[in-house]
């Protein structure tokens, strides 16, 4: 696992402890909470980040309308079970033996059940819609400038391949970023859209996960882009399985930023 060799730190994840006792005597950084070694040359998986967070001492319109199957993260934070590669296990359970199935971004996609609940496979979230509302500005941002800046951000800061940023929509004051990544499209070494979206979400909230880097300073042609609300929708390759009672209520998990 690579890391800054000179001082043994993890540039991409400050929720780690690093020591020079990895394979070949190299620097090895372990995620808090799980103790799993992470690859510091890329983003850490959302599952390991959530686990680290929970262990730490004690958020004809051009706009896309989310489909009826879009999931929003209503359950908030939990201490997840991660597989040996650091991905979410398909079935998650809490301390009181309440279990549920999650998708690849760790969002619940079934009703809650007991220990007999089966989750046969980890269903991939292949489409993420990041819905932002920016603070009032003197005028609207230029759409193409905004598009270019957000694509640059995902490419350079999160190392997400440009082909996975499907579109950037803008209708002042709402910005929507669409990330798409099918199982067949994701090659070894590619950053997962779920991980990129999580890093972006934490950046927007002023809780950057990067080591020693300043917070996110988003500017479009020099003009600060300040987000006051984010809402993230997750669409899975297989639609979620909720009871009809759940589907009659449209729950949203809002993140407010001040």
């Amino acid at each position: 696992h690579t890391a800054a060799q000179d001082n043994c730190t993890c540039p991409t994840n400050k929720m780690t402890v690093c020591s020079p006792d990895g394979p070949g005597g190299r620097c090895q950084c372990r995620a808090l909470g799980s103790g799993m070694a992470v690859d510091c040359s890329t983003l850490t998986s959302k599952c390991l980040l959530l686990k680290a967070r929970m262990s730490a001492p004690k958020n004809a319109r051009t706009l896309v309308r989310p489909s009826e199957h879009a999931l929003v993260d209503n359950d908030g934070l939990y201490d997840p079970d991660c597989d040996p590669e650091g991905r979410f296990k398909a079935r998650q359970c809490n301390q009181t033996s309440v279990c549920w199935c999650v998708n690849s971004v760790g969002v619940r996609r079934t009703d809650k059940g007991d220990l007999s609940l089966r989750c046969d496979e980890l269903v991939r979230t292949h489409h993420i819609l990041i819905d932002l509302r920016h603070r009032p500005t003197a005028g609207a941002f230029n759409h193409s400038d905004l598009d270019a800046e957000l694509r640059r951000l995902f490419r350079e800061r999160y190392r997400l391949h440009p082909k996975f940023v499907a579109a950037v929509h803008y209708e002042q004051p709402t910005i929507q970023i669409e990330l798409r990544q099918n199982t067949s499209q994701k090659a070894a070494g590619d950053v997962d859209i779920g991980d990129a979206a999580y890093y972006f979400e934490r950046d927007i909230k002023g809780e950057s996960l990067f080591q020693g880097r300043g917070g996110l300073d988003l500017r479009v042609r020099g003009e600060p882009l300040q987000v006051e609300r984010t809402l993230i929708y997750y669409l899975d390759e297989i639609p979620p399985k909720f009871s009809m009672k759940r589907l009659t209520h449209h729950h949203h998990h809002h993140h407010h930023h001040h």
Epitope: V17, G35, M36, D83
Partner: antibody
């Protein structure tokens, strides 16, 4: 050369607490994990937990979480483990070891819990 | 928690023979396995780290192999001083665990 030197044997009564020390020398104390492992008579090795001296981040085996405390004093390059509410089955040799692959071990501290 | 299962529990061989000790993990742990030798009344001694990396001062007759879930410690030609208990240990994630040990005894 790297050395881990532990404190001497202890005899304790059930319900008491014991604190064992591990003094490190010959390397940068703050940059390597210190692990604690125990071995009951005639038994195998059991990992108790670990501490990273640089920031005192400690991780405990769930089995011991409510009874064990690990600390480190960087000024004297010494790690400590304290086990409370001792029971007879805590009788064991307690070892400290360095790094994720336990490349250097202390000589062991025998803790006997007996009424 | 990752469970490490060592086999056999006891291995009876003669000096000069080849010893093959096995350690199986309950899930994929890459190469995060380490091997130790322990003699009565002594602290364990590291023999192999990260499945196959040799340790300074350890005789070359000790070697390790494997990745994922199956690991092997091989002693190419047993010397009298090699008869001891051998443990594997993983450092993949917390909690770290040890195998139950393989006792290598003289036949």
């Amino acid at each position: 050369q790297v050395q881990l030197v532990q404190s001497g044997a202890e005899v304790k009564k059930p319900g008491a607490s014991v604190k064992v020390s591990c003094k490190a020398s010959g390397y940068s104390f703050t940059t390597h994990w210190i692990h604690w492992v125990r071995q009951a008579p005639g038994q195998g090795l059991e990992w108790i937990g670990t501490i990273f001296p640089s920031n005192a981040y400690a991780v405990y085996n769930q089995k011991f979480r409510d009874r064990v405390t690990m600390t480190a004093d960087r000024s004297i390059s010494t790690a400590y483990i304290e086990l409370s509410r001792l029971r007879s089955d805590d009788t064991a040799v307690y070892y400290c070891a360095r790094a994720s692959y336990f490349d250097y071990w202390g000589q062991g501290t025998t803790v006997t819990v007996s009424s | 928690e990752i469970v490490l299962t060592q086999s056999p529990a006891t291995l009876s061989l003669s000096p000069g023979e080849r010893a093959t000790l096995s350690c199986r993990a309950s899930q994929n742990i890459g190469t995060s396995i380490h091997w130790f030798q322990q003699k009565p009344g002594q602290s364990p001694r590291l023999l192999i780290k990260y499945a196959s990396e040799s340790i300074s001062g350890i005789p070359s007759r000790f070697s390790g192999s494997g990745s994922g879930t199956d690991f092997t410690l091989t002693i190419s030609s047993l010397e009298p001083e090699d008869f001891a208990v051998y443990y594997c240990q993983h450092s993949h994630s917390w909690p770290f665990t040890f195998g139950q040990g393989t006792k290598l005894e003289i036949k």
